[in-house]
């Protein structure tokens, strides 16, 4: 077995993509490695080439089919192998049985848009991308708003504990530029994690109306 300095971590996007990262201290940067996926109850198997993302880390995406096709279910187990070329043959570096729906990381939400904006509030909607119909409504969201003079890390998180693809931001400052992001997570899965944050949506609140003489 490879020693504890190596890590092999994969996530399923719930449709047709398994993304993997393999890291190993002391591995040669130009070593040719790949991930091989072999489901226990499917006729297909898939391979992707691991490409360097840092000094000792490689990543690749197993494309299982068309982006919105449902290639795996909750009962599937996929055997994942890391193989690295040694001379003329491939050496198995790691073997992992992977339950896709225990290791979910969805795609970032898309199509963010301002539905309605006022001086102190803004209604924003979005869509989820390539998410399995198996979830039905069992999803949650986190959102954050970037206000002037602050960083994303300082932005408070707003939690939506249901499948709600819109939000009404309130107590905003008039005539001010903001940015908004959202991410999504299924409720099921031992190692399920948040999607990446969406692309930021920039918006500006309306100026306050000028006071009228009485």
């Amino acid at each position: 077995a490879v020693n504890g300095t190596s890590q092999f971590t994969c996530f399923y996007n719930s449709r047709a993509n398994i993304s993997c990262v393999w890291s190993q201290d002391g591995a040669l940067q130009d070593t040719s490695c790949q991930v091989h996926a072999w489901p226990d109850r499917r006729r297909w198997n898939q391979t992707c080439e691991l490409l360097p993302v840092s000094q000792a880390s490689w990543a690749c995406n197993l494309i299982l089919g068309a982006p919105d096709s449902q290639k795996l279910t909750t009962v599937d187990i996929v055997t994942l192998r890391v193989l690295c070329r040694e001379g003329v043959r491939w050496r198995v570096m790691a073997i992992q049985d992977f339950k896709p729906f225990e290791n979910l990381r969805l795609m970032a939400p898309i199509s963010l848009q301002v539905v309605h904006v006022e001086t102190h509030r803004c209604n924003i909607s979005w869509e989820i991308s390539q998410a399995s119909h198996y979830f039905e409504r069992h999803l949650e969201f986190e959102a954050r708003t970037l206000s002037p003079g602050h960083t994303w890390e300082e932005a408070p998180l707003l939690t939506l504990k249901q499948k709600q693809e819109w939000i009404c931001l309130e107590t905003l400052t008039p005539d001010t530029q903001y940015e908004f992001q959202v991410r999504v997570k299924p409720l099921q899965g031992e190692f399920t994690t948040w999607s990446p944050w969406s692309q930021p949506l920039a918006f500006r609140t309306k100026p306050a109306a000028l006071g009228k003489d009485t």
Epitope: A1, V2, N3, G4, S6, Q7, F8, T9, A94, Q96, D97, F98, K99, E102, N103, G189, E190, F191
Partner: nanobody, 127 residues
Framework: QVQLVESGGGLVQAGGPLRLSCAAS????????MGWFRQAPGKEREFVAA????????MYAVSTEGRFTCSRDNAKNTVYLLMNSLKPEDTAVYYC????????????????????WGQGTQVTVSS
Amino acid sequence: QVQLVESGGGLVQAGGPLRLSCAASGGTFSSYAMGWFRQAPGKEREFVAATTRGGGRTMYAVSTEGRFTCSRDNAKNTVYLLMNSLKPEDTAVYYCAAMTSYYSGTYYPDSSDFDIWGQGTQVTVSS
């Protein structure tokens, strides 16, 4: 903490299958990562497989060549090791072990990572 008892070992012909079981009692089974190790005569204890608390990820020793399958049933407080296409070199005492610390299932754990051990069950593969 849990106590572990292995069963299912015995004599089997090369090429045949065998399923080992490890029953846990006296604790919350689902709060432990579980592993299988083996020790052949005159050799050091060797990692075989380890599975996470919920069974979402399971790592296997490269030497198993995909012939072994480790699974767990948290409702039955049991972890299994299904061994197919057995070879004489698989002959060893097989140990079940439990890990109290968190295990992500993304790396190969060391035997020292496991706190609780069963007494072992002998597997002999004849040619």
